[in-house]
């Protein structure tokens, strides 16, 4: 007699979740001479301990503690960059501005990065049918709580200039519902960081608007500034021309603002 | 041919509104170009009301107008809208939608809408 | 608000011949992103304007070569090789670098 799963709105946990998650750790501590020391297999068994035979709707920090603290790593305070609501080109920077990291380029934020997973009360088995949402089903679920609590560590990790990209794309440009606005925002240490700068991602098409000026902007800045962090905001007015300055500074035709 | 057919004149008494439309004929380009508005009074040459991006709202007031104008968009029916509040006289005008054509550029203008304030 | 002044205020043209207008904002219309966004409109007498010219020099679909543009900062010119009967209305210079947008008095070209 088959057991009844409970069915989440969710989808299930990637397919070969554990594979992929020792994979990139190997991969990871190859590429990063400092994270020579990590176990790999310690990792995905703190990773696994943290949600396998657990309610998936009732996770908490505290599960991810042994995880976070195999997976600690120490990145250059001050060359932290955050992001909400575009990804793809805050990883695109930082991989030609090696100097720079986002969470993904983390130890625990790379392993985590695009995968799903999710287990069930009282069984060591991943359910790859279904996970829950975290609007429709519940906001602590082994997702989310892994992402607060590694986006919190991150940011309180953070000195001097922060950077954030957003996406100016967006009816919100700074949404407080995101990761960085519920979360990086308010842990960001005032004692240690100094300026948080914006930088407004124009899309594709040309535009001379100003989006620094944006109302959810300036709600960003308010709350910034509240927390006696100052805050600057720069348009970005040509995404594939930024990049491509980042890349080869030297050209001539990166001397305006992009 | 025809791209933006604006809303016929109208003729409002002072401390009224109005609220005008803009209809878009292409509708593949109508949700994601920001849409003006634009005013010419005689005499006075044009003023920019403002602009909206109707497929995520964002919206762009000239200082003057941010008290006056509001502006919507409907990307079903592909229409603008822009209603004006509190009329006076210093409100008659011809107003035009226009649509960038490139980035920041007018492009494609409606044909106007003669708004007449008088008691 | 930037303020566009343009100049002449009206000038009166024999078909064939070339004409001139100037447009001058009071600051300078480089936008950081690099462009330029000045542009040239025509309104024809019981007509809504027309973009002629954008970003100071590109002509818009389907105007005719006769009409160019150029200049940079804050000094622009319109010029016709040769004004034609059709040219007759109102030019008027604009400005997209910096919210509001804003737009000059205007210049009445007649023909002679």
């Known amino acids: 007699v088959p057991r009844w799963r409970q069915q989440w709105s969710g989808p299930g946990t990637t397919k070969r979740f554990p594979e992929t998650v020792l994979a990139r750790c190997v991969k990871y501590t190859e590429i990063h001479p400092e994270m020579r020391h990590v176990d790999c297999q310690s990792v995905w068994d703190a990773f696994k301990g943290a949600f396998i035979s657990k309610h998936p709707c009732n996770i908490t920090e505290e599960d991810y503690q042994p995880l976070m603290k195999l997976g600690t790593q120490t990145v250059p305070c001050n060359k932290i960059l955050l992001w909400s609501r575009i990804k793809d080109l805050a990883h695109q920077f930082t991989q030609v501005q090696r100097d720079m990291f986002t969470l993904e380029d983390t130890l625990l934020g790379y392993l985590a990065d695009d995968l799903t997973w999710c287990g069930e009360f009282n069984t060591s088995k991943i359910n790859y049918q279904s996970c829950p949402d975290w609007r429709k089903d519940c906001s602590n679920n082994p997702v989310s709580v892994f992402w607060k609590t590694v986006s919190r560590r991150f940011a309180e990790a953070a000195c001097d200039v922060v950077h954030v990209m957003l996406n100016g794309s967006r009816s919100k440009i700074f949404d407080k519902n995101s990761t960085f606005g519920s979360v990086e925002v308010h842990n960001l240490q005032p004692e240690k960081v100094q300026t948080l700068e914006a930088w407004v991602i124009h899309g594709g098409r040309e535009d001379s608007r100003d989006l620094c000026q944006d109302p959810t902007i300036k709600e960003l800045e308010s709350i910034i500034s509240k927390r006696n962090i100052q805050f600057s905001c720069k348009n970005i007015y040509r995404p594939d021309k930024f990049l491509q300055c980042v890349k080869n500074p030297e050209d001539s035709s990166c001397t305006s603002e992009i | 041919q025809v791209q933006l057919q604006q809303s016929v004149s109208e003729l409002r008494s002072p401390g009224s509104s109005v609220k005008l439309s803009c209809k878009d004929f292409d509708s593949e380009v109508f949700p994601t170009s920001y849409m003006s508005w634009v005013r010419q009074k005689p005499g006075h040459g044009f003023e920019w009301i403002g602009d909206?991006?109707?497929?995520?709202?964002?919206?762009f007031y000239g200082e003057k107008f941010e008290d006056k104008a509001k502006l919507d968009a409907d990307t079903v029916s592909n229409t603008a809208y822009l209603e004006l509040t509190s009329l006076s006289s210093e409100d008659s005008a011809i107003y035009y939608c226009?649509?960038?054509?490139?980035?920041?550029?007018?492009?494609?203008w409606g044909q106007g809408t003669l708004v007449a304030v008088s008691a | 608000d930037i303020v566009m002044t343009q100049t002449p205020l009206s000038l009166s043209v024999t078909p064939g011949q070339p004409a001139s207008i100037s447009c001058r904002s009071s600051?300078?219309?480089?936008?950081?992103?690099?462009?330029?966004?000045l542009h040239w409109y025509l309104q024809k007498p019981g007509q809504s304007p027309q973009l002629l010219i954008y970003?100071?020099?590109n002509r818009f679909s389907g105007v005719p070569d006769r009409f160019s543009g150029s200049g940079s900062g804050t000094d622009f010119t319109l010029k016709i090789s040769r004004v034609e009967a059709e040219d007759v209305g109102v030019y008027y210079c604009?400005?997209?670098?910096?919210?509001?947008?804003?737009f000059g008095g205007g210049t009445k070209l007649e023909i002679k």
């Open positions: 909206i991006l109707p497929n995520i709202g964002r919206i």
């Open positions: 600051q300078s219309l480089l936008h950081s992103n690099g462009n330029t966004y």
């Open positions: 226009a649509r960038e054509a490139y980035g920041s550029i007018l492009g494609y």
């Open positions: 604009s400005q997209s670098s910096h919210l509001p947008w804003t």
């Open positions: 970003k100071v020099s």
